[in-house]
Interface confidence: low
């Protein structure tokens, strides 16, 4: 057990100019900070819980933003941010620090929170070491801070896993610390299981071997990773040169939420990170008092240790801790191939040519509200529209008077006559058909069936404009 401590030294514009907040504060403001600790150095899913713990600072002094630029250094809350940890300190961890501004204006739902800066660092840190200083940039802001992890007696060591007890009561007088963190002042640590890794294992009871974060196996020799060794079975793999243990109760690490697995006779035991408990660390014990909700999320529930908390996330954020920014464009709100732009405070759609509206839902080229003149009918297709015009009219909107004979449709010298139902071809001698396209053979036999009674070669042939077949 121990405590992670974070001291914020300053927060203000970094070298090169005053940052402009995306929000405009209309009244007095104050700063506060949130810290989130996650185990391991790997890039965790953004919405993964702050399994090592989280803490919220007090509010800082009230200040009023200048209309032109923020103060060079904004007033900070007093005191350390402290995140207690119950189990072993993992040594490798992710540190997330958020700087928040609370607007004290008159908004529905309480003071408005806006995130000014967020820094995420992956760090190695031994417990009991000195303060580690850091300067981080977040956009145009600069954050200066120090941090350390310290064990709480009787735990000592770089992982706070060795228990330090006085060898005899006479060694420690009244009012003195139980013992100094020196090996010879402490009770000898328990003898672990033979072969238990000195680097990755520890024990609190004789004969056991419990693994630090990221290690598994009966002797804590096997890294929890996606290495080529995993998935193989048998005593070893000659192809990879990896030592692969046989099947064991900790294979595949049954402990959820960053818990580490230790084998026990015929079973396993999970050492759960702070905030989780249960046989497999599957039950969350984090409460709202731990400040688990990020990005202005509202924590509801968790009033007692057995009830799970729920983070109500503000628009634009999701995940169990409101840590994941919603890609609102993934919902594809822009129609008709529009380009989606998430501006944070709003979504915008950049529409393709021919489309308009907040979501590009209006097709400027469609038939809606587009009348085709002179009895024409509108036909949609391919994001555009066209008018199928009534006889005698043409053009985009059927507003132009068309001459059906203009295209000289009658073949072989036939004469064209415009007609209310189409056009009529008067064929030259020796030709017949709707467009005079068929020659009459010299022997008097047509290439087509005989003309109906009363229709002789050379008579005008009626040809409705919209048909493509001849009529006899």
């Amino acid at each position: 057990a121990g405590v992670f401590e974070l001291q914020i030294h300053s927060f203000g514009p970094g070298p090169g100019g005053a940052p402009r907040s995306p929000y405009s504060a209309r009244g007095p403001c104050r700063l506060f900070f949130r810290v989130c600790l996650k185990p391991g150095l790997s890039e965790e899913a953004a919405e993964s819980p702050c399994a090592l713990g989280a803490a919220l600072s007090a509010r800082g002094p009230v200040y009023t933003e200048q209309p032109e630029a923020p103060a060079p250094d904004l007033p900070l809350p007093n005191g350390l941010l402290q995140v207690p940890f119950r189990d072993a300190w993992p040594g490798t961890f992710s540190l997330i620090i958020e700087t928040w501004r609370e607007e004290l204006g008159d908004q529905i739902g309480g003071p408005a929170w806006s995130l000014l800066a967020r820094v995420t660092r992956r760090r190695r840190l031994a417990a009991g070491g000195p303060w580690a200083g850091d300067i981080q940039r977040a956009g145009a802001w600069e954050l200066r801070f120090s941090y350390r992890a310290r064990c709480e007696l009787p735990a000592v060591g770089t992982a706070c896993t060795r228990l330090c007890r006085p060898r005899s009561a006479s060694r420690c007088g009244p009012g003195l610390r139980p013992c100094a963190p020196l090996e010879d002042e402490c009770e000898a640590p328990p003898v672990c299981r033979a072969g238990c890794s000195l680097e990755h294992g520890f024990c609190e009871q004789p004969g056991e071997c419990r693994c630090l974060e990221g290690w598994t196996g009966p002797l804590c020799m096997v890294p929890v990773s996606t290495s080529s060794c995993l998935g193989l079975r048998g005593p070893s793999s000659t192809t990879t040169g990896c030592l692969v243990p046989g099947p064991g109760p900790c294979d595949g690490n049954p402990c959820a939420n960053g818990g580490s697995c230790s084998e026990t006779p015929g079973s396993f035991e999970c050492t759960c990170p702070r905030g989780f408990y249960g046989l497999r660390c599957e039950v969350s014990g984090v409460t709202c008092a731990d400040g688990p909700c990020f990005n202005g999320g509202l924590c509801v529930g968790g009033a007692d240790p057995d009830s799970a908390y729920i983070c109500h996330c503000p628009p634009g954020f999701q995940g169990s801790n409101c840590e994941k920014r919603v890609d609102r464009c993934s919902l594809q709100p822009c129609r008709n191939g529009g380009l989606c732009l998430d501006l944070g405070h709003a979504l915008r759609c950049r529409c393709r040519a021919g489309f308009a509206g907040p979501r590009c839902e209006h097709d400027l080229n469609d038939c809606a509200g587009r009348a085709c003149a002179n009895g024409g009918t509108c036909v949609e297709g391919g994001g555009a529209h066209r008018c199928s015009c009534a006889l005698g009219f043409g053009g985009r909107d059927c507003r132009e008077r068309a001459d059906p004979c203009a295209a000289r449709p009658c073949a072989h010298g036939g004469r064209c006559y415009a007609h209310f139902s189409g056009l009529v071809c008067a064929c030259a001698p020796g030709y017949m058909g709707a467009r005079c396209e068929f020659p009459v053979h010299p022997d008097g036999v047509s290439a087509l069936p005989a003309a109906p009674p009363g229709l002789r070669p050379g008579d005008p042939q009626r040809y409705p404009h919209h048909h493509h077949h001849h009529h006899h």
């Epitope: 739902g109 003071p111 709202c288 509801v300 968790g302 009033a303 109500h312 996330c313 919902l331 979504l347």
Partner: antibody
Framework: QVQLQESGPGLVKPSETLSLTCTVS????????WTWIRQPPGKGLEWIGY???????NSNPSLKSRVTVSLDTSKSQFSLNLSSVTAADTAVYYC????????????WGQGTMVTVSS | EIVLTQSPGTLSLSPGERATLSCRAS???????LAWYQQKPGQAPRLLIY???SRATGIPDRFSGSGSGTDFTLTISRLEPEDFAAYYC?????????FGGGTKVEIK
């Protein structure tokens, strides 16, 4: 001006499922949480459940096994399904908007009366 | 769940008088996550106060809220004829979100 309008049958038979829809106009349904609240005749208000467009939902444990809240962003609507209804579910059902910095309900529909009776 | 108890159940007053409505929580409400609503017969509730003491948009300044922890108060400094209605408190600190049983302010 944001407006909410509840719709659905006013009479439901016992053991059947009550289905109501709330249509949101005047703002994007993606910008807020949305909730259902009910009020039995002559009695107080009871929170039923809420939904956010990302899929986040929560409902009152006293009703949880019977409640489904869903949302359709394309129609700008969210819905309530309450299964296995009894006469005790007779109430005026309200849909409301949840302001995004605190779970107070700042805009309400006018309410729709649902009677459970055979 | 947090149980909210409102008192009195009915308050009989005359226009111009001061009304004091109480809402007591069964457990501490952190961050003053408490709201007050007004409801007139046949109408939906209307948000008056959020965060225990902040007036919602368009609410006259004769309405004020106060309190923290487990005891909260809604005060109407000078009753107008349109203020005679039912009033409900609601906590949004702990799930499930709960309402009080209501106080009816009626004309004496």
């Amino acid at each position: 001006q944001v407006q909410l309008q509840e719709s659905g049958p006013g009479l439901v038979k016992p053991s059947e499922t009550l289905s109501l829809t709330c249509t949101v106009s005047g703002d994007s349904i993606s910008n807020y949480y949305w909730t259902w609240i009910r009020q039995p005749p002559g009695k107080g208000l009871e929170w039923i459940g809420y939904i956010y467009y990302s899929g986040t939902t929560n409902s009152n444990p006293s009703l949880k096994s019977r409640v489904t809240v869903s949302l359709d962003t394309s129609k700008s609507q969210f819905s309530l399904n309450l299964s296995s209804v009894t006469a005790a579910d007779t109430a005026v059902y309200y849909c409301a908007r949840v302001f995004n910095r605190g779970f107070a309900f700042d805009i309400w529909g006018q309410g729709t009366m649902v009677t459970v009776s055979s | 769940e947090i149980v909210l108890t409102q008192s009195p159940g009915t308050l009989s007053l005359s226009p111009g008088e001061r009304a004091t409505l109480s809402c007591r929580a069964s457990q501490r409400i952190s961050n003053t996550y408490l709201a007050w609503y007004q409801q007139k017969p046949g109408q939906a509730p209307r948000l008056l106060i959020y965060g225990a003491s902040s007036r919602a948009t368009g609410i006259p300044d004769r309405f004020s809220g106060s309190g923290s922890g487990t005891d909260f108060t809604l005060t109407i400094s000078r009753l107008e004829p349109e203020d005679f209605a039912a009033y409900y408190c609601q906590q949004y600190d702990t799930s499930p979100l709960t309402f009080g049983g209501g106080t009816k302010v009626e004309i004496k």
